[in-house]
């Protein structure tokens, strides 16, 4: 009685169950009543990451330096190459097929989270008591200078873009 379903890591062909090829190998020929499935290793720069019956291996991803990409992890016969972006850039998608320059936080905004190879800079508005007077991908909002601790008084109030200006206290005559 020919099988209608096969075990895990097998497939049904010509009324018989054949073993799938292991990760890193491709199918050359189905099994027969005399021999097992014929599988061969993927070539250099190729991979298959699952038990399979593929007749061709997949090409490793190319990390194109013209797109700002570099290799984060070299591919094997069982895994694809993982790309990431050059310093100062981040991936435009989860697949990391191209890179864009990290965003800078404008004056009045500070860096909440520094960008990584896969995520952009996260900016936040400087709250009261803090300021940022530069456009930067690294600078956080800085606290206003405390005039009091320097025995000075505020001569000009700070904003989210400027620090306070301190000056000497008026002397009592």
């Amino acid at each position: 009685e020919p099988p209608t379903a096969c075990r895990e890591k097998q497939y049904l062909i010509n009324s018989q169950c054949c073993s799938l090829c292991q990760p890193g190998q491709k199918l050359v020929s189905d099994c027969t009543e005399f021999t097992e499935t014929e599988c061969l290793p993927c070539g250099e720069s190729e991979f298959l990451d699952t038990w399979n019956r593929e007749t061709h291996c997949h090409q490793h991803k190319y990390c194109d330096p013209n797109l700002g990409l570099r290799v984060q992890q070299k591919g094997t016969s069982e895994t694809d190459t993982i790309c990431t972006c050059e310093e100062g850039w981040h991936c435009t998608s989860e697949a990391c097929e191209s890179c864009v320059l990290h965003r800078s936080c404008s004056p009045g905004f500070g860096v909440k989270q520094i960008a990584t190879g896969v995520s952009d800079t996260i900016c936040e508005p400087c709250p009261v008591g803090f300021f940022s007077n530069v456009s930067s991908a690294f600078e956080k909002c800085h606290p206003w200078t405390s005039c009091e601790t320097k025995d000075l008084v505020v001569q000009q109030a700070g904003t989210n873009k400027t620090d306070v200006v301190c000056g000497p206290q008026d002397r009592l005559r």
Epitope: D30, L40, G43, T55, H56
Partner: antibody
């Protein structure tokens, strides 16, 4: 059970081409590669190349690169091996076989190259 | 791709054992566990008797056994019979969708 039946013997002149066919029956044609092997009189086996019928992709031994072409016709479950610029030393029995493992063989086709 | 190296001939008496070697390189026999052995009687197509270094197709008697060490594969025929007299060829996958054969060994059964 896969069976491979090859075309008949041929006599060719030097400089000409020969095309040998290999018709497969039994099994699923697109699910196994076909290798071509030749054997000159009194000599050993020589692997010429292979074709993957599912996509038609080929791989040829370096020695035959540029002179051999392997094709397939899925409608008739037939693969072909064409060898061009024949010379007398190409006189041999040409076999098709299933896969790289070559677990099933055709009966062989004698190609004689003679002026 | 150079041919794998086999002794041109081997012999033994009925009932004895004979071993045939097949020496390649670290790019073929040594690199992959995809060595096959074939038996060819005169006037016939070759017949697969061993694949994947040591596996026998169903129907091939266990008198035929094989192994591999480093860059050399070996076929042993034990309990020699008159019908074992034939040519024996090894082959190995050599990477990049290439295959290479040995030069062949003529096995003679004496007596």
């Amino acid at each position: 059970q896969v069976q491979l039946v090859q075309s008949g013997a041929q006599v060719k002149k030097p400089g000409s081409s020969v095309k040998v066919s290999c018709k497969a029956s039994g099994g699923t044609f697109s699910s196994y590669a076909i290798s071509w092997v030749r054997q000159a009189p009194g000599q050993g086996l020589e692997w010429m190349g292979m074709i993957n019928p599912s996509g038609g992709t080929t791989s040829y031994a370096q020695k035959f690169q540029g002179r051999v072409t392997m094709t397939r016709d899925t409608s008739t479950s037939t693969v072909y091996m064409e060898l061009s610029s024949l010379r007398p030393e190409d006189t041999a029995v040409y076999y098709c076989a299933r896969g790289f493992r070559m677990d099933q063989w055709g009966q062989g086709t004698l190609v004689t190259v003679s002026s | 791709q150079s041919a794998l190296t086999q002794p041109p001939s081997a012999s033994g008496s009925p009932g004895q054992s004979v071993t045939i070697s097949c020496t390649g390189t670290s790019s073929d026999v040594g690199a992959y566990n995809f060595v096959s052995w074939y038996q060819q009687h005169p006037g016939n197509a070759p017949k697969l008797i061993i694949y994947d270094v040591r596996k026998r197709p169903i129907g091939i008697p266990d008198r035929f056994s094989a192994s591999k060490s480093g860059n050399t594969a070996s076929l042993t025929v034990s309990g020699l019979q008159a019908d074992d007299e034939a040519d024996y060829y090894c082959s190995s996958y050599a990477g990049n969708n290439n295959l290479v054969f040995g030069g062949g060994t003529k096995l003679t059964v004496l007596g």
